[in-house]
C-alpha cells in the first residue's frame, strides 16, 4: 500500500554567504492532511525554520503556493545567508490532529554548506623599528571563512618565504574559520622600498586570491654613517666644516654640533636628499671664526636617529698657524665637488 | 488563447535522443508547472516528467529516470524534454501539459497540447 | 503506485441516455481524483477535477462523484460531439495514475 514519503533530493546544497538558499522537498502523497515544517538539526534541541501553520518566518519563503490543497511542493528559500546558518535541514509532515498535528514523516535532510569569504588579510608587523641584519616577526590574520581548507603564503618583494608558522582556528567543526600566521624577515640596508605580502588562497575567491602588505619602510630604521670634513677657506679667519650625514631611514635626525665639547647649533634634518635605495643623505656645515680661537678646536657632529641614542663624529682643527692656509692644508678631507654644490 | 504546441518528434533509432519543445502561450507561463505525458499507440495515459514553475523542482516517473530531462526557459515560454537512450517502449505521443494551479507542484492537467510522435525503431 | 481500474472498457449508448463509468483506485485517494476527455486524434481535456469540480467551460451535462475508493462520472444526456474516450486520474500518490480509459460510442 502507498504511504506518504517525505522526499529531499538533495543531500547536500552549497551556497555563498548572502546568497539565497533553496531547500527541496516533495511529499509523495497529498494525504494525510496536515502541515510542513522545516527543522534546523533533530532531536529534541532541534530548531524551528518554518512553519507552514504559524509564526512569522522573514527570511524564509516558500517556492510554491502551500495554500493551494494540491500542492506537492514544501520546498523553501532561506536569503541572505550566512555561515551560522549551516546545518541539516530536514523537512517533516505533520498529520492533522486535536490538539495538536502529530508528526507522520521526516525527509531524509539536506546539509547546508556556506561558503563564506575571507576577509582581506592584515599584516602587521613589530612595534619597534629594527635595523639590518636582525630578524623581525611580521603577522597576517583573515577570518570568517568557510569551508576550512585555506592556503596562506608569504613573499618578500615577490620572493616566497619559508620561515613562517600557520594556524587555522578553531581545530574543530565551527561555522567559520580564522587563520593566523607569523613569518620571520631579516632585514636588509636595502629594504625601504620592500614589501611584505601575506596571500591567502580560498575555495571561494575563484583563483583570485586576496593580499594583505607591509611596506618594511614601516619597520626598518637605517642608522646613519657620518663624515666631517673640513672646506677650503672662505672667508678672512673663517674654516667651514661639513657633516655629511649618509644612508639613514627613516627621515628624523637632529643634528648637534659641539665645539670643544660645547653646543654650538642643533639643527633637525630638513631638506634631504633621497637615495635610490630610499635611504637619506643630509649635509650640515659649521663655519668656524679661527680667530677667535687660541687653541685647537675639537669639532664634534652628534647625530640623535629617530630618537636613538646620538652617534658623533669628531675632526680636529687646528687654529695656530698659517690660518689662512688652513683649507688648502686640509682640502685632502674633502669629499667631492658634489657635496659642495648641496650647500 | 491558451495554447500549448509541441514540436521535435520523429523516427529515431534505439539508443539515440531526441529533444522535444513546447511552446507556450497566452498565459503566463513562469507561474505554472509544467508536465510532459505520454501515450502510446491505442494505450492509456502515462505520466513522464513536471517541472516546477521556475525550474527549482523536477520529478521523473520511473520509467525514464535517468534518461530523460525536463527543463524550461522562462524567458522563451518554451518547455522541453531531452529524451536520451531511447527505447521502442519510448515510442508514444507526448504531450506538454499545464498544471492547473499556479505556483503548486500539483498533479491536476487543465491545458494540453496537441501532441507530438516519437517513434524509436531501428 | 496507485492502480485506477475503468469500467467499462467501452460502452455504446443512445444520443439522450444518461451514462456511467466508473472508477476504482487501488487505496484512498480522498477526493483527488480528475477525468479527461480525448476525442480521436485529440489531446485529453479536463472535465471534471476534485472528484465533483466543474472545469470552467465544460457542459453541465457532465458530472463526477465519489470519495475515497469508488468514483463516479456520469454524462446526464449523452449527445454525438461526446463520443470519445474518458480516463480518470488520480493525483494524491506519485507518480499520477491514469484508469484504462472508457470508449464511448453512439448506437
Known amino acids: 500500500e502507498e504511504e506518504l514519503q517525505v522526499i529531499q533530493p538533495d543531500k547536500s546544497v552549497l551556497v555563498a554567504a548572502g546568497e539565497t538558499a533553496t531547500l527541496r522537498c516533495t511529499a509523495t502523497s497529498l494525504i494525510p492532511v496536515g502541515p510542513i515544517q522545516w527543522f534546523r538539526g533533530a532531536g529534541p534541541g532541534r530548531e524551528l525554520i518554518y512553519n507552514q501553520k504559524e509564526g512569522h518566518f522573514p527570511r524564509v519563503t516558500t517556492v510554491s503556493d502551500l495554500t493551494k490543497r494540491n500542492n506537492m511542493d514544501f520546498s523553501i528559500r532561506i536569503g541572505n545567508i550566512t555561515p551560522a546558518d549551516a546545518g541539516t535541514y530536514y523537512c517533516v509532515k505533520f498529520r492533522k490532529g486535536s490538539p495538536d498535528d502529530v508528526e507522520f514523516k521526516s525527509g531524509a535532510g539536506t546539509e547546508l554548506s556556506v561558503r563564506a569569504k575571507p576577509s582581506a588579510p592584515v599584516v602587521s608587523g613589530p612595534a619597534a623599528r629594527a635595523t639590518p641584519q636582525h630578524t623581525v616577526s611580521f603577522t597576517c590574520e583573515s577570518h570568517g571563512f568557510s569551508p576550512r581548507d585555506i592556503t596562506l603564503k608569504w613573499f618578500k618583494n615577490g620572493n616566497e618565504l619559508s620561515d613562517f608558522q600557520t594556524n587555522v582556528d578553531p581545530v574543530g567543526e565551527s561555522v567559520s574559520y580564522s587563520i593566523h600566521s607569523t613569518a620571520k624577515v631579516v632585514l636588509t640596508r636595502e629594504d625601504v622600498h620592500s614589501q611584505v605580502i601575506c596571500e591567502v588562497a580560498h575555495v571561494t575567491l575563484q583563483g583570485d586570491p586576496l593580499r594583505g602588505t607591509a611596506n618594511l619602510s614601516e619597520t626598518i630604521r637605517v642608522p646613519p654613517t657620518l663624515e666631517v670634513t673640513q672646506q677650503p677657506v672662505r672667508a678672512e679667519n673663517q674654516v667651514n666644516v661639513t657633516c655629511q650625514v649618509r644612508k639613514f631611514y627613516p627621515q628624523r635626525l637632529q643634528l648637534t654640533w659641539l665645539e670643544n665639547g660645547n653646543v654650538s647649533r642643533t639643527e633637525t634634518a630638513s631638506t634631504v636628499t633621497e637615495n635610490k635605495d630610499g635611504t637619506y643623505n643630509w649635509m650640515s656645515w659649521l663655519l668656524v671664526n679661527v680667530s677667535a680661537h687660541r687653541d685647537d678646536v675639537k669639532l664634534t657632529c652628534q647625530v640623535e636617529h629617530d630618537g636613538q641614542p646620538a652617534v658623533s663624529k669628531s675632526h680636529d682643527l687646528k687654529v695656530s698657524a698659517h690660518p689662512k692656509e688652513q683649507g688648502s692644508n686640509t682640502a685632502a678631507e674633502n669629499t667631492g665637488s658634489n657635496e659642495r654644490n648641496i650647500y | 488563447q491558451v495554447q500549448l504546441v509541441e514540436s521535435g518528434g520523429g523516427v529515431v533509432q534505439p539508443g539515440r535522443s531526441l529533444r522535444l519543445s513546447c511552446a507556450a502561450s497566452?498565459?503566463?507561463?513562469?507561474?505554472?508547472?509544467m508536465h510532459w505525458v505520454r501515450q502510446a499507440p491505442g494505450k492509456g495515459l502515462e505520466w513522464v516528467a513536471v517541472?516546477?514553475?521556475?525550474?527549482?523542482?523536477?520529478l521523473y516517473a520511473d520509467s525514464v529516470k535517468g534518461r530523460f530531462t525536463i527543463s524550461r526557459d522562462n524567458s522563451k515560454n518554451t518547455l522541453y524534454l531531452q529524451m536520451n537512450s531511447l527505447r521502442a517502449e519510448d515510442t508514444a505521443v507526448y504531450y506538454c501539459?499545464?498544471?492547473?494551479?499556479?505556483?503548486?507542484?500539483?498533479?491536476?492537467?487543465?491545458?494540453w497540447g496537441q501532441g507530438t510522435m516519437v517513434t524509436v525503431s531501428s | 503506485d496507485i492502480q485506477m481500474t475503468q469500467s467499462p472498457s467501452s460502452l455504446s449508448a443512445s444520443v439522450g441516455d444518461r451514462v456511467t463509468i466508473t472508477c476504482q483506485a487501488s487505496?484512498?485517494?480522498?477526493?483527488?481524483l480528475n477525468w479527461y476527455q480525448q476525442k480521436p486524434g485529440k489531446a485529453p481535456k479536463l472535465l471534471i477535477y476534485?472528484?465533483?469540480n466543474l472545469e470552467t467551460g465544460v457542459p453541465s451535462r457532465f458530472s463526477g462523484s465519489g470519495s475515497g475508493t469508488d468514483f463516479t462520472f456520469t454524462i446526464s444526456s449523452l449527445q454525438p460531439e461526446d463520443i470519445a474516450t474518458y480516463y480518470c486520474?488520480?493525483?494524491?500518490?506519485?507518480?499520477?495514475?491514469f484508469g484504462g480509459g472508457t470508449k464511448v460510442e453512439i448506437k
Open positions: 486520474q488520480q493525483f494524491t500518490y506519485l507518480p499520477p495514475t
Open positions: 497566452g498565459f503566463t507561463f513562469s507561474s505554472y508547472g
Open positions: 487505496q484512498d485517494i480522498s477526493n483527488y
Open positions: 501539459a499545464r498544471t492547473q494551479l499556479k505556483y503548486t507542484l500539483g498533479f491536476a492537467f487543465d491545458i
Open positions: 476534485d472528484a465533483s
Open positions: 517541472i516546477a514553475y521556475d525550474g527549482s523542482n523536477k
